[in-house]
Interface confidence: low
């Protein structure tokens, strides 16, 4: 029977800068029941606080609701593991909410084949930003990436769309069924998961008339 091993805070994510969650990996349990507590203080403060919500984020997590989240300050946090034989502490982690945003995937992905007269046909892709993100405040710049591939192909073709919420793709294989997905990231943050795939059948007469 030993004191617990050193825990590690391995991930913190925020969907929208308004709330965030951090997760830790327990160290070895030393063969005894082990309690974990996360404590933190904000930059410019000396007061230590305990995690406000150990439930919402699931096991080994701490969730910071709106009233505990400030994007103006760095959070300095650590996890304490305690059993009957002693305690151990994780390394301090510095968390800036601005830099841990991982939005939900974009919504309302729509894909359409356009064949304008006397022009090259193209695939027109359109989407909406995730609901939780408020772009009007100017606090967020969302960047988008599209991926698509023929249904049976192994490789994805990636296109970077910048801040646009629509995109045109010209070079496609006629007669193929394509999968299309889109994802987004804040200007400094993490890519969202890919949106659910949308399927589109490319007509056989999708020809390139130069």
């Amino acid at each position: 029977q030993l004191p617990p091993g050193k825990p590690e805070i391995f991930k913190c994510r925020s969907p929208n800068k308004e709330t965030f969650t951090c997760w830790w990996r327990p160290g070895t349990d030393g063969g005894l029941p082990t309690n974990y507590s996360l404590t933190y203080h904000r930059e410019g403060e000396t007061l230590m606080h305990e995690c406000p919500d150990y439930i919402t984020g699931g096991p080994n997590s701490c969730h910071f609701g709106k009233q505990y989240t400030s994007m103006w300050r760095t959070y300095i946090m650590m996890v304490n593991a305690t059993n009957q034989m002693g305690s151990s502490f994780s390394d301090e982690l510095y968390v800036d909410v601005t830099y841990i945003v991982q939005p939900d995937p974009p919504l309302e992905l729509a894909v359409e084949v356009k064949q304008p007269e006397d022009r090259k046909p193209y695939l027109w892709i359109k989407w909406s930003p995730p609901t939780l993100i408020d772009l009007k405040t100017g606090w967020f710049t969302l960047l988008y990436e599209i991926r698509l591939k023929p249904e049976k192909a192994a490789e994805w073709e990636i296109h970077f769309a910048g801040q646009q919420t629509e995109f045109k793709i010209l070079s496609l294989h006629p007669g193929q069924k394509y999968l299309v997905q889109v994802r987004c990231k804040p200007d400094h943050g993490y890519w969202s998961a890919w949106s659910p795939a949308t399927f589109i059948q490319i007509p056989s007469d999708f020809t390139m008339n130069d």
């Epitope: 930059e43 000396t46 994007m71």
Partner: antibody
Amino acid sequence: EVQLLESGGGLVQPGGSLRLSCAASGFTFSSYWNHWVRQAPGKGLEWVSDISRASSYTNYADSVKGRFTISRDNSKNTLYLQMNSLRAEDTAVYYCARGLDARRMDYWGQGTLVTVTS
Amino acid sequence: QSVLTQPPSASGTPGQRVTISCTGSSSNIGYGYVVHWYQQLPGTAPKLLIYRNNVRPSGVPDRFSGSKSGTSASLAISGLRSEDEADYYCAAWDDSLNGWLFGGGTKLTVL
């Protein structure tokens, strides 16, 4: 070696404008907050403004709000202070400073003198 | 009004211990914000001397120490030396101003 080098100071008439620059070297500029702090001749330090790493957030002292604009170009490792509607009381040495975790100012430039007089 | 108040001057003889106070209010030091101290030698830019109330950056002699209690902070210099003659400023974030506050500065003279 961390270096901050201010430029752009000089003599200007009341109501005029100046743009100060601060060239940074010796560290990853985009990883730090940055500040402007000024010091009137024979007086103490007065914080003017700060800006976050990716320019998402800016703060200003009440005395300059609406007249001064802080900005940065991370590709050029340069901090700026656009000063409009200058007044005699803006006369000071202007320092740029690097901000660390609690945004404390850990390195300072040598300053550039701005003189506002008619 | 938010201010950090420091005595305008302080003095001591070589080898003595000198303390400089910095008094704030409930919107800055008393709110829980940490205090930083800067040293400005004549004709030079300020230099970070103490941060987060009592931490010395590398290269700062252990003759310099800081403390904080309630709405006040203090800087102590022991074993005073002639090269310590300088202006000393405290600084803290102020919640009501949403900005940094510097104390008025204390001119330290080594007699």
